[in-house]
C-alpha cells in the first residue's frame, strides 16, 4: 500500500436546501484505470461511511441508488455532492481515494471538509 496526497476544502457551508458540494483532488502517481472514492463522516470521535463509489477513469461515478451522494470525475478530481443534509449532519467529511487498478495499490485520505448545515428557519404561522 502506497500513500497518496488528497486535497479538499477545509470549510464549506451547505445550501439552504441541505446540499453540499466539494472537490476532492488526488495526486495520482500513475495511470490508474479503476478508482474508489469513499466519503467518511467524523463527529464526536466516531467515523462512519457516508457513501462510496468505484469508477473507471473517464466514466461516471456510480453510487448506490439510495445513496445521498452523487459525483462526477474529471482527471484527478472528483466533484462530490451530498444531499438531504440537516443541521445534525454538521461534521467533518473526509475524502478517501483508493487507486484499485492497475497495481500498485495507492491510498490517500484528505484532511476533511468541515460541512456546516443550517436548518431553514420555520415559516411564521399564517392567519390564512
Amino acid at each position: 500500500c502506497k500513500a497518496m496526497h488528497v486535497a479538499q476544502p477545509a470549510v464549506v457551508l451547505a445550501s439552504s436546501r441541505g446540499i453540499a458540494s466539494f472537490v476532492c483532488e488526488y495526486a495520482s502517481p500513475g495511470k490508474a484505470t479503476e478508482v474508489r472514492v469513499t466519503v467518511l463522516r467524523q463527529a464526536d470521535s466516531q467515523v462512519t461511511e457516508v457513501c462510496a463509489a468505484t469508477y473507471m477513469m473517464g466514466n461516471e461515478l456510480t453510487f448506490l441508488d439510495d445513496s445521498i451522494c452523487t459525483g462526477t470525475s474529471s482527471g484527478n478530481q472528483v466533484n462530490l455532492t451530498i444531499q438531504g443534509l440537516r443541521a445534525m449532519d454538521t461534521g467533518l467529511y473526509i475524502c478517501k481515494v483508493e487507486l484499485m487498478y492497475p497495481p500498485p495499490y495507492y491510498l490517500g485520505i484528505g484532511n476533511g471538509t468541515q460541512i456546516y448545515v443550517i436548518d431553514p428557519e420555520p415559516c411564521p404561522d399564517s392567519d390564512f
Epitope: 470549510v11 445550501s15 439552504s16 468541515q114 443550517i118
Partner: antibody
C-alpha cells in the same frame, strides 16, 4: 504568513449603509470561510454571520437578517460586509476573521461610528 | 441557540498564580467544538485553544483547555504580565456561532 487587512474607520448617519472590506493573503482563500464579529464600546464579542468562500453560501445572525450582506471576491481574496439602515447601536469595531471552524486569524478591526 | 456562560466575570490574581476560567454551555457542544480567545485593550481577539484542548499555533504551553459536553475550562498555569486580558469562549459546532460574555483577568 496569513494576514487579514480591513478598510479604514467610517462615520455614518443613522439610516445610511456601510461596507467594510477584508483583504486576505497567505492562504487558499476559497478553502475557508470568513466571519464577521462586532464589538460595541466596552462590550463583548457579537457574532454577525459568515460566508463560505468556497461556494458563497451565507449564514447570518438572526437579529441582523435583512440588514446585513456578506460577499466575497475570489479574484482578489477579499471579503465584504455591508450593513444597512444603520442605527446608533451599530456603533462598534467590526472584525473579520478566517473560519477554519474556529476563527484562527483576525483582521485589525474597523471602527464604524453611527452618529447624527 | 447555544448560550455560553462564563465565570467568574472578573478574576483578580497576581503574576505567577494559576488562573482557572470556566465556560458552561446551555446544551452539549458537539465534537468539543469549543474555542478560547484572548483580547487585550485596543486589539483584535487572538485564538488560544480550539477543539476544547488543542493549542493554536504559537500559544505558550502555560495555556491549556479541557472539558467536553457542557463544561469547559481554560487554565493558565502561571500568569505572566502579558496574560492580563479578557478571555472569551466560543462554540463553533452549531450555527449561530456564539461567544460567552468574557472573563476579565486583572492584576490583584
Amino acid at each position: 504568513q496569513v494576514q487579514l487587512v480591513q478598510s479604514g474607520a467610517e462615520v455614518k448617519k443613522p439610516g445610511a449603509s456601510v461596507k467594510v472590506s477584508c483583504k486576505t493573503s497567505g492562504y487558499t482563500f476559497t478553502s475557508y470561510g470568513i466571519t464577521w464579529v462586532r464589538q460595541a464600546p466596552g462590550q463583548g464579542l457579537e457574532w454577525m454571520g459568515w460566508i463560505s468562500a468556497y461556494n458563497g453560501n451565507t449564514n447570518y445572525a438572526q437579529k441582523l437578517q435583512g440588514r446585513v450582506t456578506m460577499t466575497t471576491d475570489t479574484s482578489t481574496s477579499t471579503a465584504y460586509m455591508e450593513l444597512r439602515s444603520l442605527r446608533s447601536d451599530d456603533t462598534a469595531v467590526y472584525y473579520c476573521a478566517k473560519v477554519s471552524g474556529y476563527f484562527d486569524y483576525w483582521g485589525q478591526g474597523t471602527l464604524v461610528t453611527v452618529s447624527s | 441557540e447555544i448560550v455560553l456562560t462564563q465565570s467568574p466575570g472578573t478574576l483578580s490574581l497576581s503574576p505567577g498564580e494559576r488562573a482557572t476560567l470556566s465556560c458552561r454551555a446551555s446544551q452539549s457542544v458537539s465534537s468539543s467544538y469549543l474555542a478560547w480567545y484572548q483580547q487585550k485593550p485596543g486589539q483584535a481577539p487572538r485564538l488560544l485553544i480550539y477543539g476544547a484542548s488543542s493549542r493554536a499555533t504559537g500559544i505558550p504551553d502555560r495555556f491549556s483547555g479541557s472539558g467536553s459536553g457542557t463544561d469547559f475550562t481554560l487554565t493558565i498555569s502561571r500568569l505572566e504580565p502579558e496574560d492580563f486580558a479578557v478571555y472569551y469562549c466560543q462554540q463553533y459546532g452549531r450555527s449561530p456561532f456564539t461567544f460567552g460574555p468574557g472573563t476579565k483577568v486583572d492584576i490583584k
